[in-house]
Interface confidence: low
């Protein structure tokens, strides 16, 4: 009887495949007159269409690369695998969908990089004193979680330009604390102090050398520093095969994109590295602060987990920001930073207790839906994250990819990866919109009223000015 | 297409001057229309970046523009035991410009000021200043409402209350129909922000060159606040005027405070005594709600409506990913004394980092359908992020949600095409309002001329065979 395939009035194989994933096309010349060429596959076979003349592509998922998940992160870190499979190929016909799955493991003893980014405005004077021995303490604590730790240090105040900076009397440029009858450092935007190192005592030494500065207004320029610490990977020394923690400590509000106009700065932040040989951020006075969106993009690109370690007075502010910057955690810093050690350890635990998938470069015509199998083999529909994990746990996700219509570009790829991981699954998609019989098309065919059309897939495709089943 | 995207007129300014940062139409007393363009990084007489203002006579083929002459030299004056100083290097003259009647107001929000007395000082800070010019008569005046002679020590003793030293007056500017200059000063009162208002006529009559510190008796300034929601709120980042209380004899002020309440952002509508009539809150932190404000009647009910831009708004896309695209909020003014409620329409940008909503300009009735239309800029949107201006037509329900026209930047990437916009004035005298678009990164301004709308009616005549 009639069905969706036969009632749409299609006149070509391509049109037929686009009606529904259930439709098939018969290109057999011997198909009895009056039998529809576009129909359910079983109906075409009943109508004696030769099986080899039936066009009925089937969507499929093929695994192309599948290294097994690693147990440990120590050893040759470039061989550590936390996501499986690593590459699959999807073939989808119009409006069809296909399922595939991905497994993620939080491997044990994975290398960790911690970069400590500190507000050195005047009110952080006591905090600087508190963290002088943080390096060795951090190493002791983190040794329980990783045998491969590196730590580094950087500092920020704000853009050294009026009105953020004191510019008079002349002495204030060299000593912004001049009118307070005390001494502090000239103001700076961001300076990189210590490249990530496993010599943890170097951290203590460098911190002891630091001194606070002073700026005029309440918000600081920490977002400039976050951006530079994120994108200057060589300068900072972020390793490819390590967890990246960027610890941001402050007791104040922060400047955001478009604030720079108050200093006459309107050039949008370009998200590039501008830390020169002097280890200072060279574009501090020429480029605006980065936006939350740009920071999110760069943190995600570089697989960096941002930790806002902030004092009680601004914790709500940074909590709100963290909801707009996925993968960010917030901890309450004591007024003198004395609890920062526990804060980092807790934040790292929080980061490792969660796996959340993110998708990059998803073609517009594709939509994905997720089902998560987290703990106890329980399937949770619509979820693409798992919480409450212990290091070493493995979770899996079932993903359905559905295509809308028939995209113009026939091949595309996208990536699925856990937030903060370097490992990912690359999905190569082929959109199967064409029929194999099109390759045997016969232009100017005698079958089409002596050359008035192309004979293709068992029917005539008429040239300009000609109509009819034989272009008559 | 109402705005001709092909036959453009271009005006260019000096390289690196940021010509096009601000702009306005200027009608002189003889009805001639020109374009005033701000170029805040123009080099001054001593090769310092003082900024500058250019007056571009309308000419279909465009070209160069003569600059308006202002005193760009630093000034010093001794008054009793005090020394008053102005500093005009990097003052940003032309960061905002506005024209009213035959007067041009051009502001330098980063003009610095200091007062020295023995070993003490007020501190060298960006109080900001606005220069006024009547090009035909050659008259000049200056208005700097945040200059004062209080020394730093006094501010410390008073816990920095009423501290106008970082005002940046003229960061935004507008003139009411009655000729009152209203300046936004987002750094006023220690970065809360303030508004200053004074009649243009009184600014001219009270001005004496070289005095440096004088009083405009009819001026009024908004008030300081101890409410933490206002701290670092940059109240005055943008400003507009309109009619929002039903009394046609008064004008209300619309003020953008994009970092109000810990960067949530807000826009407030005030009466001329700075009493708040309405407050509209931002929707998303750090979206910069209030970066731009515009007032026009879009739905043809005779009441002014309000548009607010939040160029850093992030939209939740597929996979719950946030994409920074920018958003414009339309608030229709209801009948009677009711508060402006929820936005009637949200226009959301489509391009990542395009900053849709950076500037909004009323266009007048572009398509002659009885409803006023608007233009919205996305200075980093469009192909290759070169910038884009989108036209939205008015209708009885408010605005149409799809643009009627999209103007892609004729300039290269990084030009910030659309950073400044002005419309609703007929520059070429064809009876249709035109649009001027600044692209400070290219140091250029483009003029888009509106063309007559062709209304086609089709009649089908069927003849008996």
């Amino acid at each position: 009887g009639p069905n969706i395939c036969t009632t749409r009035g299609v006149s070509s194989c391509q049109q037929c495949l686009a009606v529904s994933p259930m439709c098939a096309w018969c290109s057999d010349e011997a198909l009895p007159l009056g039998s529809p060429r576009c129909d359910l596959k079983e109906n075409l076979l009943k109508d004696n269409c030769a099986p080899e003349s039936i066009e009925f592509p089937v969507s499929e998922a093929r695994v192309l690369e599948d290294r097994p998940l690693s147990d440990k992160g120590s050893g040759d870190s470039s061989q550590v695998t936390q996501v499986s499979p690593q590459r699959i190929a999807l073939r989808l016909r119009p409006d069809d969908s296909k399922n595939f799955s991905i497994q993620v493991r939080q491997v044990e003893d994975y290398p960790v990089d911690i970069y400590y980014l500190m507000d050195l405005s005047y009110s952080m004077k006591d905090d600087l004193w508190s963290i002088q021995n943080l390096g060795t303490k951090l190493a002791t604590q983190m040794r329980k979680l990783t045998s491969n730790l590196r730590i580094g240090f950087g500092a920020f105040v704000d853009k050294p330009v009026s009105p953020y900076m004191y510019i008079s009397p002349p002495e204030a440029l060299e000593n912004p604390c001049y009118d307070m009858k005390t001494t502090c450092l000239p103001m700076f935007g961001y300076k990189h102090v210590l490249t990530l190192t496993d010599q943890v005592t170097r951290f203590n030494e460098e911190v002891k050398k630091q001194s606070v500065s002073r700026n005029r207004d309440a918000p600081e320029g920490g977002f400039d520093a976050i951006m530079q610490a994120t994108v200057c990977d060589e300068k900072i020394g972020w390793r490819n095969d390590a967890s990246h923690l960027l610890v941001f400590t402050t007791d104040a509000k922060t400047h955001i994109a478009l604030d720079g106009r108050l200093a006459g700065i309107v050039q949008p932040n370009d998200g590039q590295c501008h830390v020169g040989s002097d280890n200072h951020y060279s574009a501090s006075t020429t480029m605006d602060y980065p936006s939350l969106g740009l920071m999110t993009e760069k943190l995600s690109q570089k697989n960096i987990n941002l930790i806002f370690a902030v004092t009680e007075n601004v914790v709500n502010l940074y909590q709100n920001y963290s909801e707009l910057i996925p993968g960010t955690t917030v901890g309450v810093l004591s007024m003198d930073s004395s609890n920062v050690l526990q804060l980092i350890v807790d934040a790292y635990g929080k980061i490792r207790s969660k796996v959340e998938l993110e998708v990059r470069d998803l073609p517009e015509e594709l939509s994905l839906s997720f089902n998560a199998t987290c703990l106890n083999n329980e399937v949770i529909p619509g979820l693409k994250s798992c919480m409450g994990l212990k290091i070493g746990d493995t979770v899996s996700f079932s993903i359905e990819a559905k295509v809308r219509g028939c995209p113009q570009e026939k091949e595309k790829s996208f990536t699925i990866k856990p937030v903060g991981f370097k490992d990912s699954l690359i999905v190569q998609v082929t959109f199967d919109c064409d029929c194999a019989c099109q390759a045997q098309a016969e232009p100017n065919s005698h079958r089409c009223n002596n050359g008035n059309g192309t004979f293709e897939c068992g029917v005539c495709r008429c040239g300009p000015g000609w109509l009819g089943s034989q272009c008559e | 297409l109402n705005l001709d995207p092909v036959q453009l007129t271009f005006y260019a300014g000096p390289n690196g001057s940021q010509f096009g940062f601000s702009l306005d139409f200027h009608k002189d007393s003889h009805g001639r229309v020109a374009i005033v363009v701000g170029a805040p990084r123009t080099l001054g007489p001593s090769q310092e970046e003082t900024g500058g203002v250019f007056l571009c006579p309308w000419r279909a083929e465009g070209g160069q523009c003569p600059s308006l002459l202002f005193d760009l030299r630093d000034e010093t004056r001794n008054v009793g035991s005090q020394t008053l100083q102005t500093f005009k290097a990097r003052q940003g003259l032309g960061a905002s410009v506005v024209s009213w009647s035959d007067v041009i107001v051009a502001c330098a929000p980063w003009q610095h000021w200091n007062v020295l007395e023995k070993t003490e000082e007020a501190e060298k800070t960006p109080v900001g200043s606005c220069f006024l010019a009547q090009p035909e008569s050659g008259r000049r005046a200056e208005y700097s409402p945040c200059r004062g002679n209080t020394l730093s020590r006094i501010y410390v003793e008073n816990d920095f209350s009423w501290d106008k030293r970082y005002c940046e007056a003229g960061f935004s500017s507008v003139v009411t129909q009655a000729g009152e200059l209203v300046l936004g000063a987002p750094g006023g009162y220690y970065f809360l922000g303030l508004l200053a208002q004074a009649p243009v006529a009184d600014i001219f009559s009270s001005y004496r060159p070289g005095i440096l510190l004088w009083h405009v008796s009819s001026q009024s300034l908004s008030f300081d606040s101890s409410n933490p929601e206002y701290f670092d709120g940059y109240w005055g980042y943008s400003v507009a005027v309109g009619e929002f209380d039903g009394d046609l004899n008064t004008t209300e002020y619309v003020v953008g405070a994009p970092t109000w309440s810990w960067t949530l952002g807000a826009v407030e509508i005030l009466d001329s005594y700075y009493q708040r009539l309405h407050r509209l809150r931002g929707e998303q932190m750090a979206s910069y709600f209030g970066h731009s404000v515009a007032v026009t009647d879009v739905n043809g009910d005779g009441r002014h409506d309000l548009l607010v831009g939040a160029p850093l708004y992030m939209e939740s896309r597929a996979d719950r990913k946030l994409a920074e695209v920018g958003r414009v909020y339309l608030f229709l003014q209801p009948r009677g004394p009711h508060a402006l409620g929820a936005p009637s329409l949200l226009l959301t940008g489509t391009q990542l980092y395009g900053r849709f909503g950076s500037a909004i300009a009323p266009l007048g009735d572009l398509d002659r359908d009885g409803y006023n239309d608007i233009a919205v800029a996305a200075p980093y949107g469009g192909p290759s992020g070169r910038g884009q201006v989108l036209v939205f037509l008015g209708q009885s329900e408010g605005l149409r949600s799809r643009p009627s026209q999209v103007l892609d930047s004729p300039f290269p990437t990084g030009s910030a095409f659309g950073f400044s916009l002005r419309g609703a004035v007929d520059i070429d005298d064809n009876g249709y309002p035109d649009l001027i678009v600044g692209a400070y990164g290219a140091n250029q301004v483009a003029v888009y001329r509106a063309q007559p709308v062709v209304k086609a009616s089709v009649q089908l005549l069927v003849q008996d065979s």
Epitope: - | S29, H30, A60, Q64, P135
Partner: antibody, heavy 118, light 107 residues
Framework: QVQLVQSGAEVKKPGASVKVSCKAS????????MHWVRQAPGQGLEWIGA????????SYIQKFKGRVTMTRDTSTSTVYMELSSLRSEDTAVYYC???????????WGQGTLVTVSS | EIVLTQSPDFQSVTPKEKVTITCRAS??????LHWFQQKPDQSPKLLIK???QSMSGVPSRFSGSGSGTDFTLTINSLEAEDAATYYC?????????FGQGTKLEIK
């Protein structure tokens, strides 16, 4: 291209009036100011005033106020300058000049010699 | 009103020589100054607008400079056809005024 064609030479007695015409072509007549400048024999150029044909707005310098009248006829794209109560020192060549879109006197008429003599 | 003072009033020069005519304004006029050439029994002709912008069709030997109150018209390598009177004019503010003129004679 832009052309400004002035009326012919005139000889007038003191106290009389003279009306000089300037016919414009090659541009939109109503969009640009037309100025008048005079030059006494062997002397420099002296600006008299201007008219905006779009709305008949005029502007004269103090010296000529009350004696000079500028008018326009848009149907013929012609501007007129009438000077009354003529004196011998008004003997001069009178030029019309177009104040173009760049605010400069780029186009000039050929000049009209007005001689005031008893 | 703004007074423009030209110097010299008269100059007699041999061909191929470089000529400099100056124009001083009684107050600052930015770059709103223009130079005209007038030959006997002819209308004035605009040479330079806004202090330094040459009009199209004007020989490249003519150039202008200056800003504020002091302006210069320079003719490099004078030619016989350059014999004329040269006027400066300001359009900074009404009334628009001209300099008294500089007459250039070819020896």
């Amino acid at each position: 291209q832009v052309q400004l064609v002035q009326s012919g030479a005139e000889v007038k007695k003191p106290g009389a009036s003279v009306k000089v015409s300037c016919k414009a072509s090659g541009y939109t007549f109503t969009n640009y100011w037309m100025h008048w400048v005079r030059q006494a024999p062997g002397q420099g150029l002296e600006w008299i005033g201007a008219i905006y044909p779009g709305n008949s707005d005029t502007s004269y310098i103090q010296k000529f106020k009350g004696r000079v009248t500028m008018t326009r006829d848009t149907s013929t794209s012609t501007v007129y300058m009438e000077l009354s109560s003529l004196r011998s020192e008004d003997t001069a060549v009178y030029y019309c000049t177009l104040y173009d879109g760049y605010y400069v006197f780029a186009y000039w008429g050929q000049g009209t010699l007005v001689t005031v003599s008893s | 009103e703004i007074v423009l003072t030209q110097s010299p009033d008269f100059q007699s020069v041999t061909p191929k020589e470089k000529v400099t005519i100056t124009c001083r304004a009684s107050r600052d006029i930015s770059n709103n100054l223009h130079w005209f050439q007038q030959k006997p029994d002819q209308s004035p002709k605009l040479l330079i607008k806004y202090a330094s912008q040459s009009m199209s069709g004007v020989p490249s030997r003519f150039s202008g400079s200056g800003s504020g109150t002091d302006f210069t018209l320079t003719i490099n390598s004078l030619e016989a056809e350059d014999a004329a009177t040269y006027y400066c004019q300001q359009t900074n503010s009404w009334p628009y005024t001209f300099g008294q003129g500089t007459k250039l004679e070819i020896k």
